[in-house]
Amino acid sequence: WQAAPKSYAIRDSRQMVWVLSGNSLIAAPLSNRVKPVTLHLITCRDTEFSDKKKGNLVYLGIRGKDLCLFCEEIQGKPTLQLKEKNIMDLYMEKKAQKPFLFFHNKEGSSSVFQSVSYPGWFIATSSTSGQPIFLTQERGITNNTNFYLDSVEGGGGSGLNDIFEAQKIEWHE
């Protein structure tokens, strides 16, 4: 048996998806014109930082790229970054790689991702399209911290694999 990350399309309540622009993740309206990323999600094997109240411990990566989401402090503020890293390398580490870890919690049918390194900081999208995905403490109207994970594998013949691999233009504002 070989562990493998699960694949999801991700969107928020305003139907904005995540798009790779260079080495940054930005939010863009779900559209024929953009190619959304497929999120790779895999559970962390090390239980050091486990907290079931906060959710499952997961690593997040971008499918088809050796890129993973991680959190670091920049000028005193927790910041969401993409780092060149294979998600399976993180998974295979015996010790949890804290900067790359997120608590994945379900709120109804939506998902919330909280940084393990910076408790109370959540992955968010702005209500304005073309803005980077970021970390916020402000949950609510302006910042969307609730996401819908749409399964890419199986899924009743959704044809998502074909759609995502089709030729799309890269997002630009």
Partner: antibody, heavy 122, light 112 residues
């Protein structure tokens, strides 16, 4: 081939609740990445989106109708339904159910029911 | 008042080309959400004519085409035929409303 069929009373009294059901055939209401919607069309007028529900159970409602609308899914019957409370004559319309797929129709509706006329009158 | 604005009516003779405009705002078409077009023949349900701004579902003749620029979109019909006489609606998604929006509809009359 996916098909949708609306059903429900054609006459509703003012102040009562309008209830309609859309039966899905040729596909599953729980199909991944699918959303289901209700749209209405008053006689001689244009289309108005009422609300939608998707395969995750998330609901989205027209702000102008939100306080009166409930959309729900019955997976065992492969149906989704609309309830519109406190109706008035202004709610008289042909009601359509429709569907689309997030990553294939990009928030458009590619399959529609034939529509059912609901008249609000005492 | 519709969120998306369309002309109430357009007309053309058989064989001619007509266009129908659809004007939105920065929270729908201008926010890069796609525009879809529907054809509604008299007494029938709407039918998807164009999706994702400029894509035709299978079975829709290539006489129908869509385009989008800025906060507006348009539907073009070339080689107009009598059976094209119908109402046409544009539709998009509005993030400020967190919902789907339609244009008011345009009645196409084929003259003669």
């Amino acid at each position: 081939e996916l098909q949708l069929q609306e059903s429900g009373p054609g006459l509703v009294k003012p102040s009562e609740t309008l209830s309609l059901t859309c039966t899905v055939s040729g596909g599953s209401i729980t199909a991944s990445n699918t959303y289901w919607g209700w749209i209405r069309q008053p006689p001689g007028k244009g289309l108005e989106w009422i609300g939608s529900i998707d395969y995750t159970g998330s609901t989205y409602y027209n702000p102008s109708l939100k306080s009166r609308v409930t959309i729900s899914v019955d997976t065992s019957k492969n149906q989704f339904s609309l309830k519109l409370s406190s109706v008035t004559a202004a709610d008289t319309a042909v009601y359509y159910c429709a569907t689309g797929k997030y990553y294939e129709t990009y928030l458009g509706f590619d399959v529609w029911g034939q529509g059912t006329l609901v008249t609000v009158s005492s | 008042e519709s969120v998306l604005t369309q002309p109430p009516s357009v007309s053309g003779a058989p064989g001619q080309r007509v266009t129908i405009s659809c004007t939105g705002s920065s929270s729908n078409i201008g926010a890069h959400y796609d525009v879809h077009w529907y054809q509604q023949l008299p007494g029938t349900a709407p039918k998807l004519l164009i999706y994702g701004n400029d894509n035709r579902p299978s079975g829709v003749p290539d006489r129908f085409s869509g385009s989008k620029s800025g906060t507006s979109a348009s539907l073009a019909i070339t080689g107009l035929q009598a059976e094209d006489e119908a109402d046409y609606y544009c539709q998009s998604y509005d993030y400020s409303l967190s919902g789907y929006v339609f244009g008011g509809g345009t009645k196409l009359t084929v003259l003669g």
